[in-house]
């Protein structure tokens, strides 16, 4: 698929890896919160 225009911004190039890591970390935290919530609901 075509790259979004923002990928042309130098910032995208310089921060791509850290932004991807930050997003992965955020998703992991979200998944952890969801698990905790399910545990509470399940009790």
């Amino acid at each position: 698929s075509e790259e979004p225009p923002i990928s042309l911004d130098l910032t995208f190039h310089l921060l791509r890896e850290v932004l991807e890591m930050a997003r992965a970390e955020q998703l992991a935290q979200q998944a952890h919160s969801n698990r905790k919530l399910m545990e509470i609901i399940g009790k």
């Epitope: 225009p5 923002i6 911004d9 130098l10 910032t11 310089l14 930050a22």
Partner: antibody, heavy 118, light 112 residues
Amino acid sequence: EVQLQQSGPELVKPGASVKMSCKASGYTFTDYFMKWVKQSHGGSLEWIGVISPNNGDTFYNQKFKGKATLTVDKSSSTAFMQLNSLTSEDSAVYSCARGTDRALFAYWGQGTLVTVSA
Amino acid sequence: DVLMTQTPLSLPVSLGDQASISCRSSQSIVHSDGNTYLEWYLQRPGQSPKLLIYKVSNRFSGVPDRFSGSGSGTDFTLKISRVGAEDLGVYYCFQGSHIPWTFGGGTKLEVK
């Protein structure tokens, strides 16, 4: 013409928080990341963080994690920065800036002066 | 963090003279992609910073050719061949190769 118009000066009490804005015009807001910079009274410049107006992804200078929160409103092409638990150390001019495909800080807002005082 | 050290702190010049500002990084600022993301900015009194030079030696659009940037690795220089009144202000170097991105402390160009 690329323009970044920032909100006016703020006088706030220690411990309070402040939210400033940066309205972009003259280009497609979602095509470029927005950065924020702190300029202390002595003149030194510090990069605070960056936000993608596209999807709201943020990345912060470790020094400003927990101090600054960056958000955007795509409908009004406006970026925001909230600073919390303010102390006298946070008294400074805060600027938003946009890059290009070649440089990181090609266009700057005029800055918002924040004064923290009891 | 990469420390960017500028010298001199203050540079008194006569209009029409050449000025030279040095910027030294605490470690190499060659990015893993091979580029060196070293930029120069001028902040005139009461104004926001303006981009002059990007990637060490490239002038940004509208910047006069009397401004030139050079250097590599850890040592960089900004030269102004004929200083005009509009060139007075504080010059900052900046590196975007390593996170966190960092600015130099500034060099004030003023009339002698």
